[in-house]
Interface confidence: low
């Protein structure tokens, strides 16, 4: 028996369902009584889900997994993982045994989009050219960790005096805070881009300083 899985990682959004595809080619006359199917975590060998002795043995992993019982006889051994969490990320191995056996591993990459950044300015009044200001760009609840880029109004990257911190909450999602310290020109726009490298999702925020008032 030959097991086939996706070569590419499966990307799943947090709180959505993911399908880890696994298939085999059943011989003519194959019946489910012959099938032993085991899904496990590749690294720890922890059992995730199994089908043995002609029946679905159920989920051994947070009660959030399911097979596709009607499709098993056709060679579809895929696993459905419900309400994906950050901690589900990793490699899963699909073992199929009929007379002989084969296995293959598929990677699950968890992702969550970042929120539109909020921009704050300190100080936020009595601003004059030559003043040093601190602009903070904050974006929330993303995964994995973000890449943060700053640009001025002409699109020129601002790399000096940037400090970015990222902190995971109890769900493993990251809140990103990036601080730019800059000397004000006569007027200017400062843009922050928060990129999720897995989703290739960009979230933009900007602040324009033209004397008073400020535009966010």
């Amino acid at each position: 028996v030959e097991v086939q899985v996706s070569e590419d990682p499966v990307v799943a959004l947090v709180d959505t369902d993911a399908t880890l595809r696994c298939s085999f080619s059943p011989e003519p006359g194959f019946s489910l009584a012959q099938l032993n199917l085991i899904w496990q975590l590749t690294d720890t060998k922890q059992l995730v889900h199994s089908f043995t002795e002609g029946r679905d043995q159920g989920s051994a992993y947070s009660n959030r997994t399911a097979l596709f019982p009607d499709l098993l006889v056709q060679g579809n051994a895929s696993l459905r993982l419900q309400r994906v969490r950050v901690t589900d990320e990793g490699s899963y191995t699909c073992f199929v045994s009929i007379q002989d056996f084969d296995s293959a591993a598929v990677s699950l990459q968890v992702a969550a989009p970042y929120s539109k950044p909020s921009m704050t300015l300190e100080p936020n009044k009595d601003l004059r050219p030559g003043n040093m200001v601190t602009i903070t760009c904050s974006s929330y609840q993303g995964y994995p960790e973000a890449e943060v880029f700053w640009k001025d109004g002409q699109g020129v990257p601002l790399t000096g005096n940037v400090t970015t911190s990222q902190m995971a909450n109890e769900r493993g999602l990251f809140d990103v805070h990036s601080v730019l310290r800059v000397v004000l020109g006569a007027n200017g726009t400062y843009s922050c881009l928060v990129r999720n490298p897995v989703l290739q999702q960009d979230a933009h925020g900007s602040v324009t300083i033209t004397g008073q008032p400020l535009t966010f």
Partner: antibody
Framework: EVQLLESGGDLVQPGGSLRLSCAAS????????MSWVRQAPGKGLEWVSG?????????YYADSVKGRFTVSRDNSKNTLYLQMNSLRAEDTAVYYC??????????????WGQGTTVTVSS | EIVLTQSPGTLSLSPGERATLSCRAS??????LAWYQQKPGQAPRLLIY???SRATGIPARFSGSGSGTEFTLTISSLQSEDFAVYYC??????????FGGGTKVEIK
């Protein structure tokens, strides 16, 4: 410049302990899987341990060091560690830290430190 | 664990010659293989990943091929700086990540 710099190698007696450090610079350390790889004198490369970026930082070990070595990372300090306990003569080697080629994956290592030498001998 | 067997152990060639290094896996690793170069007293350097993709800054004379269990690293025309030890490494099935025993390319 992307750089890894190991330290902490020393001469230690069998049964002793040592902690190696690997200081990273020039890249977003917290986004990359990291590994420790060693090379005994005149021998080939042997993967020792790896640590993920995932929530909780999953750690992985070669059978030869499991239960004796502990890998950890401090993303706030951009530093990777290897705590080595119950050291044996066969642990004598140059220890390298390596960074995975691309963020969020564990595959091949494109950035290596210069290595730090651990000698276990009485 | 997956065992990688490299051959030959030593390859004696002259500058300008073509070098062909082999790496065999104990079971299929699809294309999940990397090649490294190591010179005496230095850290390894990544040459090839994904069996055939050149790493950043690696000259075109280095090429990788193969999938499943049989892999080849080819250096089309050896330069003086290419004489070194070459290792293959698999990342299809881990832990552990495993390396081959190495092939030394020396000057004839």
């Amino acid at each position: 410049e992307v750089q890894l710099l190991e330290s902490g190698g020393d001469l230690v007696q069998p049964g002793g302990s040592l902690r190696l450090s690997c200081a990273a610079s020039g890249f977003n350390f917290s986004s990359y899987w990291m590994s420790w790889v060693r090379q005994a004198p005149g021998k080939g490369l042997e993967w020792v341990s790896g640590i993920s970026i995932s929530y909780g930082g999953n750690a992985y070990y070669a059978d030869s060091v499991k239960g004796r070595f502990t890998v950890s990372r401090d993303n706030s300090k951009n530093t990777l560690y290897l705590q080595m306990n119950s050291l044996r003569a066969e642990d004598t080697a140059v220890y390298y830290c390596g960074r995975d080629r691309s963020p969020y994956q564990y595959r091949s290592m494109d950035v290596w430190g210069q290595g730090t030498t651990v000698t276990v001998s009485s | 664990e997956i065992v990688l067997t490299q051959s030959p152990g030593t390859l004696s060639l002259s500058p300008g010659e073509r070098a062909t290094l082999s790496c065999r896996a104990s079971q299929s690793i699809r294309s999940d293989l990397a090649w490294y170069q190591q010179k005496p007293g230095q850290a390894p350097r990544l040459l090839i990943y994904g069996a055939s993709s050149r790493a950043t800054g690696i000259p075109a004379r280095f090429s990788g091929s193969g999938s499943g269990t049989e892999f080849t690293l080819t250096i089309s025309s050896l330069q003086s700086e290419d004489f070194a030890v070459y290792y293959c490494q698999q990342y299809n099935n881990w832990p552990p990540l495993t390396f081959g025993g190495g092939t030394k390319v020396e000057i004839k």
